[in-house]
């Protein structure tokens, strides 16, 4: 069962004091049903699982991907699943940890040890299901080692959000991801209304950035659903 | 300040209805993955379900999977938690969460991080 399967992640999702480290400093909340400890920061119990629901990579952390917790699994349940580390299997890059991407279905060290000037690279983007297998179209595409150590700059070829600088984002661009600007207020964003529907897009927008969110601007809203234009508002 | 509310709890006879609401105030979530999680007398919190921002991935616990249904509006900042055929062991305070946003801000994990104050739901038998 999705539990039992589960369990084994129990304290993945284990915050730090709240209003700590989890970048929201200072913010006032609600904490956890939880202990409390000296100097009044309440920390959630580690009682059992938190899954943390997705559609896609980009709303898991760093250290994970997003994908059905089974095989074969239900298609509508994907939540975030801590990061493949190095020589173990995978199916795309975000599967692998910061360090590493997925080469010939195993993740590998993008250390620049590994590297002998550039590497050439297949860059499988699976159209409609990210996380099917590896069919889909394929593209070469050129990757400099040095993007593994210096965050990419606007333009740069990344695998993941974490390969670019502040404030950009690894997005798709045709058969390749670059890093792109993080979107602000009252820029076009994007709203995957089903699941799956940002593996269509090649030229892919990155989401709102913070205290942003992507909705319907307000003149459009008696427009056709097809033809409602999503801009980045604040909260 | 960030603050989630919960209502729609109360006391209900086994096999009947509730409908749980979790409105976000302040800096709100819908970009966020929000869930609900209950903590019931000398028992740990247990998850209940939760919703990805854009609705399309839902979770369920396997003991509450086919009754419960979580859906959200995002227009109104509101997670809302279905709770259909209940039963005396689905007696509980019932927290909404909200979640982080994952790498969208750089942390390693996408948790939970904002908590509501909880409404009590009650099924008699």
């Known amino acids: 069962t999705l539990n039992s399967v589960l369990n084994s992640n129990a304290i993945k999702n284990l915050p730090p004091p709240l209003g700590g480290a989890a970048g929201h400093p200072g913010s006032a909340v609600s904490a956890a049903p939880g202990i409390l400890y000296p100097g009044g920061n309440k920390y959630q119990t580690i009682d059992n699982y938190q899954p943390y629901p997705c559609a896609e990579d980009e709303e898991c952390g760093t250290d994970e991907y997003c994908a059905s917790p089974t095989r074969g699994g239900d298609a509508g349940v994907q939540i975030c699943l801590a990061c493949r580390k190095r020589r173990k299997r995978c199916m795309r890059h975000a599967m692998c940890c910061p360090g590493n991407y997925c080469k010939n279905g195993i993740c590998v060290s993008s250390d620049q040890n590994h590297f002998r000037g550039e590497i050439e690279e297949t860059i499988t983007e699976s159209f409609g299901n990210d996380h099917s297998t590896l069919d889909g179209y394929s593209r070469r595409t050129t990757l400099s080692s040095k993007m593994y150590h210096t965050k990419g700059q606007e333009g740069s070829v990344c695998l993941r959000s974490s390969d670019c600088a502040s404030g950009l984002c690894c997005a798709r661009h045709f058969w390749s991801k670059i890093c792109k600007p993080v979107l602000k207020e009252g820029q076009v964003c994007t709203k995957h209304r089903r699941k799956g529907s940002h593996g269509l897009e090649i030229f892919q927008r990155c989401y709102c950035g913070e205290g942003l969110s992507c909705r319907i601007q307000k003149d459009h809203h008696q427009a056709s659903n097809s033809s409602r234009l999503h801009t980045c508002q604040r909260h | 300040e960030v603050q989630l509310v919960e209502s729609g709890g109360g006391l209900v006879q086994a096999g009947g209805s509730l409908r749980l609401s979790c409105a976000a105030s302040g800096r709100t979530f819908s970009s966020y993955a929000m869930g609900w999680f209950r903590l019931a007398p000398g028992k740990e919190r247990e998850f209940v379900a939760a919703?990805?921002?854009?609705?399309?991935?839902?979770v369920y616990a396997d003991s509450v999977k086919g009754r419960f249904t979580i859906s959200r509006d995002n227009a109104k900042n509101t997670v809302y938690l279905q709770m259909n055929s209940l039963k005396p062991e689905d007696t509980a305070v019932y927290y909404c969460a909200a979640g982080n946003g994952g790498r969208t801000y750089g942390h390693s994990r996408a948790r939970y991080d904002y908590w509501g104050q909880g409404t009590q739901v009650t099924v008699s038998s």
């Open positions: 919703i990805s921002w854009s609705g399309g991935s839902t």
